[in-house]
Interface confidence: low
């Protein structure tokens, strides 16, 4: 069979950017593009994404957001450019190459989007005294994939007690995360929320510092 090569690791692409799904083959010395049949398709549904046959680019069948690298095809570069990446693009794409023989390989696209700096709210937010039970809410928006949320005190020690975290996908598939910490106030202290994107290994931090009265929130970065 024809050897078709793709990267082993998933291609990570930020939402809204362009991604290149690399695929290559080794053409014979006498190879001409007229002999080439190239098909990119979604691995799971077999939906056609892009194709090249009969010596010419047959175009995108995938929302007109794909392109080949025509000047590089003759050298065995069958890579696909996917423009304006969306969450819904995540998954496995298969590159089929047929000349005399044929071969195929699948490449995974992992989509990612950074989470916004968390906004922090505190309830109740006045007349607080040590020993009071308060609810601190950390909200971060439009990230992907689902976040990991961690709470810490001012010394960096984890706060794992009464935490409720919910994540909701919007119409674009991006997640809004809301994490609620219920905690008994100490004499003073800082409560930090860390929202981690597991793919980008990106951390977004928010914190609220309680120093008696009044409550102070750090300025937004």
């Amino acid at each position: 069979a024809l050897e078709v090569q793709v990267p082993e690791d998933p291609v990570v692409a930020l939402v809204g950017t362009d991604a290149t799904l690399r695929c290559s083959f080794s053409p014979e010395p006498d190879f001409s593009l007229a002999q080439l049949n190239l098909i990119w398709q979604l691995t799971d549904t077999k939906q056609l994404v892009h194709s090249f046959s009969e010596g010419r680019d047959q175009g995108s069948a995938y929302a007109n957001r794909t392109a080949l690298f025509p000047d590089l095809l003759a050298q065995g570069n069958a890579s696909l450019r996917l423009q304006r990446v969306r969450v819904a693009d995540e998954g496995s794409f298969t590159c089929f190459v047929s000349i005399r023989d044929f071969g195929s390989a699948a490449v995974s696209l992992q989509v990612a989007a950074p989470y916004s700096k968390p906004s922090m709210t505190l309830e109740p937010n006045k007349d607080l005294r040590p020993g009071d039970m308060v609810t601190i809410t950390c909200s971060s928006y439009r990230g992907y994939p689902e976040a990991e949320v961690f709470w810490q005190d001012g010394q960096g020690a984890p706060l794992t007690g009464n935490v409720t975290t919910s994540q909701m996908a919007n119409e674009q598939g991006l997640f809004d995360v809301r994490s609620v910490l219920r905690v008994v106030l100490g004499a003073n202290g800082t409560y930090s929320c860390l929202v981690r994107n597991p793919v980008l290994q990106q951390d977004a931090h928010g914190s609220v510092t309680i120093t008696g009265q009044p409550m102070t929130f750090p300025p937004e970065a």
């Epitope: 799971d44 995540e90 496995s92 995974s108 909701m168 996908a169 119409e171 598939g173």
Partner: antibody, heavy 120, light 107 residues
Framework: QVQLQQSGAELARPGASVKLSCKAS????????MQWVKQRPGQGLEWIGT????????RYTQKFKGKATLTADKSSSTAYMQLSSLASEDSAVYYC?????????????WGAGTTVTVSS | DIQMTQTTSSLSASLGDRVTISCRAS??????LNWYQQKPDGTVKLLIY???RLHSGVPSRFSGSGSGTDYSLTIDNLEQEDIATYFC?????????FGGGTKLEIK
């Protein structure tokens, strides 16, 4: 909170049809593919097919083409599966399940299952 | 269709043990491997998706690993509430297919 509520147990005669329902709440019903999965007593799980309620697009595994028909009602956020020409091998628990992130075929929320018993 | 094989159909372990459940695919599934827990009452829950990503709300004692055709689910410090049947499922190619399940029991 995201929930899938399935209809109650069904007892049916061989050759008859049944229509199972799965009511979704807590999320945008039209944005997620809904799956149906079969489990025979003491057996593993078997994927039947999926429907995208936003436009009614469906996919079936070969074995269940002609046996199962998937539909969805956007107004009531309810997915349905009709099983026709019932036979004893259709006796099973049927689950509906929401597919998670687009393009990743995992099922993040499951209904409690509906038991279908086919008996004469 | 891709065949998923869980060679161990039942497994006995003691509370506090570390338990590993294996799953093999009939071909490379590019890490598109998910794990589910089915309790004796029939309730099914997603534990891990894409080989190692812990689903929201799942205790951190559950972890997943693997690549190519061989994957595993590990439960550290086994608890009574972990008594269930565990299924693997590939999501690389339609139709999605499940392993036969591994029933976990207490010694």
């Amino acid at each position: 909170q995201v929930q899938l509520q399935q209809s109650g147990a069904e007892l049916a005669r061989p050759g008859a049809s049944v229509k199972l329902s799965c009511k979704a709440s807590g999320y945008t019903f039209t944005s997620y593919w809904m799956q149906w999965v079969k489990q025979r007593p003491g057996q593993g799980l078997e994927w039947i097919g999926t429907i995208y309620p936003g436009d009614g697009d469906t996919r079936y595994t070969q074995k269940f083409k002609g046996k199962a028909t998937l539909t969805a009602d956007k107004s009531s956020s309810t997915a349905y599966m009709q099983l026709s020409s019932l036979a004893s091998e259709d006796s099973a628990v049927y689950y509906c399940a929401r597919r998670g992130i687009p393009r990743l075929w995992y099922f993040d929320v499951w209904g409690a299952g509906t038991t279908v018993t086919v008996s004469s | 269709d891709i065949q998923m094989t869980q060679t161990t159909s039942s497994l006995s372990a003691s509370l506090g043990d570390r338990v590993t459940i294996s799953c093999r695919a009939s071909q490379d599934i590019s890490n598109y491997l998910n794990w589910y827990q089915q309790k004796p009452d029939g309730t099914v829950k997603l534990l891990i998706y894409y080989t190692s990503r812990l689903h929201s709300g799942v205790p951190s004692r559950f972890s997943g690993s693997g690549s190519g055709t061989d994957y595993s689910l590990t439960i550290d410090n086994l608890e009574q509430e972990d008594i269930a049947t565990y299924f693997c499922q590939q999501g690389n190619t339609l139709p999605p297919t499940f392993g036969g399940g591994t029933k976990l029991e207490i010694k």
